[in-house]
């Protein structure tokens, strides 16, 4: 039976013999932001019984992670490139707090977490270079992000624990619809 | 262990309306990342995607075909059925559901159905 | 639509041979290229995907190589289970497309 790169793949496609465009450039280094995620969830499921958990959706409450939804105009149907991309950069930059929350979270993965995060970034520079309406941006207000940082790390254990494995989770698959919406820009 | 079984009527009459159904088991439809596909093969010829569907219901279709088809999921039954109208003779193929995606989003079939051969015919 | 013409339409090798199968896209499609397998009666078999990459449970003398145009898959020693059709498929960009199969029968 095939098995293809997974959540417990390193395997990134094969060097190339000639020169990226800017789309194929972008979409192999969400693949590796997508492998070190991967990485990171390897540890969290193993050092804990959180990805079995059914006691997601009170946590999740607490929590208000980017999705992508169908009037993020993302989807095939009413596809919108400009609102699109809008969305998925104002999406990566809500995402940064929760980054910064990882990074003490790890014992084993410290580098592979710091380096999700700092491939997060460069994704977000190489995704304002493309978009056309710079404006319609919104960078999410520091005070507010210290204020939720600090919340955050004030929780329980298990909360901690529960958190962790949400944003790691929500953050796989906004890459994931980002892939594929961009393969269509 | 990954499975994918077609089911549907073998025999069609031009004009009419075929409705599949692919069963799955071993993956949840509603993985990130993870999608179901359908692909055609007429006797003796090639392979040509028809549509698929992923994990949070985004569609896409093969334009050429795209009036006449319509996907969709039913994820706690673990199903996918693809309808294609006003059938020709033309479209005797056998379909195959295939599973699609992975963490990548890949746009690649890993695992297949064995298929089911459609007849269109008066 | 990207168009993937594979050649030749039929390779007519002995078992122990080496099988070159060919596949040239219509525009770039970078290393977004995969491979199929297709005996008489089955469903297609993932061989290879993004143009070299192997996948556990196929065989070794399976390789893929090339990107951009032009793509190769080798088959190192042809074993009796490998006479069938090979199908590549444009993974880049909608609609996918497949080549039309290499047909790898026995000399």
């Known amino acids: 039976a095939p098995v293809l790169p997974g959540e417990d793949s390193k395997n990134v496609a094969a060097p190339h013999s000639q020169p990226l465009t800017s789309s194929e450039r972008i979409d192999k280094h969400i693949r590796y932001i997508l492998d070190g995620i991967s990485a990171l969830r390897k540890e969290t499921c193993n050092r804990s019984n959180m990805c079995e958990s059914s006691k997601e959706a009170l946590a999740e409450n607490n929590l208000n992670l980017p999705k992508m939804a169908e009037k993020d105009g993302c989807f095939q149907s009413g596809f919108n490139e400009d609102t699109c991309l809008v969305k998925i950069i104002t999406g990566l930059l809500e995402f940064e707090v929760y980054l910064e929350y990882l990074q003490n979270r790890f014992e084993s993965s410290e580098e592979q977490a710091r380096a999700v995060q700092m491939s997060t970034k460069v994704l977000i520079q190489f995704l304002q270079k493309k978009a056309k309406n710079l404006d319609a941006i919104t960078t999410p207000e520091p005070t507010t992000n210290a204020s939720l940082l600090t919340k955050l790390q004030a929780q329980n254990q298990w909360l901690q624990d529960m958190t962790t494995h949400l944003i790691l989770r929500s953050f796989k698959e906004f890459l994931q619809s980002n892939l594929r919406a961009l393969r269509q820009m | 262990q990954v499975t994918l079984k077609e089911s549907g009527p073998v025999l069609v009459k031009p004009t009419e309306t075929l409705t599949l159904t692919c069963t799955v088991s071993?993956?949840?439809?509603?993985?990130?990342?993870?999608?179901v596909g359908w692909i055609r093969q007429p006797p003796g010829k090639a392979l040509e995607w028809l549509a698929h569907?992923?994990?949070?219901?985004?569609?896409r279709y093969n334009s050429a075909l795209k009036s006449r088809l319509t996907i969709s999921k039913d994820t706690s039954k673990s199903q996918v059925v693809l309808t294609m109208t006003n059938m020709d003779p033309v479209d005797t193929a056998t379909y195959y559901c295939?599973?699609?995606?992975?963490?990548?989003?890949?746009?690649?079939?890993?695992?297949w159905g064995q298929g089911t051969l459609v007849t269109v015919s008066s | 639509e990207i168009v993937l013409t594979q050649s030749p339409a039929t390779l007519s090798l002995s078992p122990g041979e080496r099988a070159t199968l060919s596949c040239r896209a219509s525009?770039?499609?970078?290393?977004?290229l995969h491979w199929y397998q297709q005996k008489p009666g089955q469903a297609p078999r993932l061989l290879i995907y993004?143009?070299?990459q192997s996948i556990s449970g196929i065989p070794a003398r399976f390789s893929g190589s090339g990107s951009g145009t032009d793509f190769t898959l080798t088959i190192s020693s042809l074993e009796p289970e490998d006479f069938a059709v090979y199908y590549c498929?444009?993974?880049?960009?909608?609609?996918?497309?497949f080549g039309q199969g290499t047909k790898v029968e026995i000399k």
């Open positions: 071993g993956f949840s439809l509603s993985t990130s990342g993870m999608g």
């Open positions: 993004y143009a070299s």
């Open positions: 498929q444009n993974g880049h960009s909608f609609p996918w497309t």
């Open positions: 295939a599973r699609i995606g992975g963490l990548y989003v890949d746009y690649l079939m890993d695992y």
């Open positions: 569907i992923w994990w949070d219901d985004d569609k």
């Open positions: 525009q770039s499609i970078s290393d977004y």
